[in-house]
Amino acid sequence: FERTRSLQDPCSNCPAGTFCDNNRNQICSPCPPNSFSSAGGQRTCDICRQCKGVFRTRKECSSTSNAECDCTPGFHCLGAGCSMCEQDCKQGQELTKKGCKDCCFGTFNDQKRGICRPWTNCSLDGKSVLVNGTKERDVVCGPSPADLSPGASSVTPPAPAREPGHSPQ
């Protein structure tokens, strides 16, 4: 019965960009201005999303697809389909309820969004710190301290990198 009913349902013939109009004996009517239906067989058209305030229009609404928003400069999208805009901070900062705050010692953030994360603990992998961390950058772990002791390895150390712009003496 369900299959028979769907075959006889006049609404199933209504294409995207239209809706099945109950006020007109279920004929397919084009979506009114500033509304859309992205699939066939719809009984209503959805109101177009409006990108206002901190949101800006990335893609205009059409009768068959909704508008898409992103955020104005200085903000970034959060949530599915950019449902919210959140303020950017600088690298080395995180957004708190009181605004952008520098990362605490021992943490870093290399992006304009997100939270400060702890530096990598090199010793957990048995390695040593090769380059210290900053608010903007994680530490760089190097060989283990044992590898650095004299005679611990027969591997030839790499040649020091030349600074750009200097020719060999």
Epitope: P30, C31, P33, E60, C61
Partner: nanobody
Framework: AVQLVESGGGLVQSGGSLRLSCAAS????????IAWYRQGPGKQRELVAW???????HYVDSAKGRFAIWRDNTKKTTYLQMNSLKLEDTDVYYC?????WGQGTQVTVSS
């Protein structure tokens, strides 16, 4: 209210062409949606082609590749060019915008 008047229907041989016109008078918004429907005796009106509020032309599957809809805003007229007509295209064709309907124009395709 908007008044719509269709013209251009008639008798044409299978494979032939017709151009229907829909002249609008009254207060028409620049975003107005205009559509062509067809209706046979004892049947429901069926959408054929329409110009959406975003000014994009759309067609039902049976009209794709054969029919073309466009409008001339200076003349407040919308056209439906019907090519490669088939016997099953025989119907009364109506122009519609919002709650306004034209009186219809008969299209008859003969073999």
């Amino acid at each position: 209210a908007v008044q719509l008047v269709e013209s251009g229907g008639g008798l044409v041989q299978s494979g032939g062409s017709l151009r229907l016109s829909c002249a609008a008078s009254g207060n028409i918004s620049s975003l107005h949606v205009i559509a062509w429907y067809r209706q046979g005796p004892g049947k429901q009106r069926e959408l054929v082609a329409w110009i959406a509020w975003d000014d994009i032309a759309h067609y039902v599957d049976s009209a794709k590749g054969r029919f073309a809809i466009w409008r001339d805003n200076t003349k407040k007229t919308t056209y439906l060019q019907m090519n490669s007509l088939k016997l099953e295209d025989t119907d009364v064709y109506y122009c519609n915008s919002g709650d306004s309907w034209g009186q219809g124009t008969q299209v008859t395709v003969s073999s």
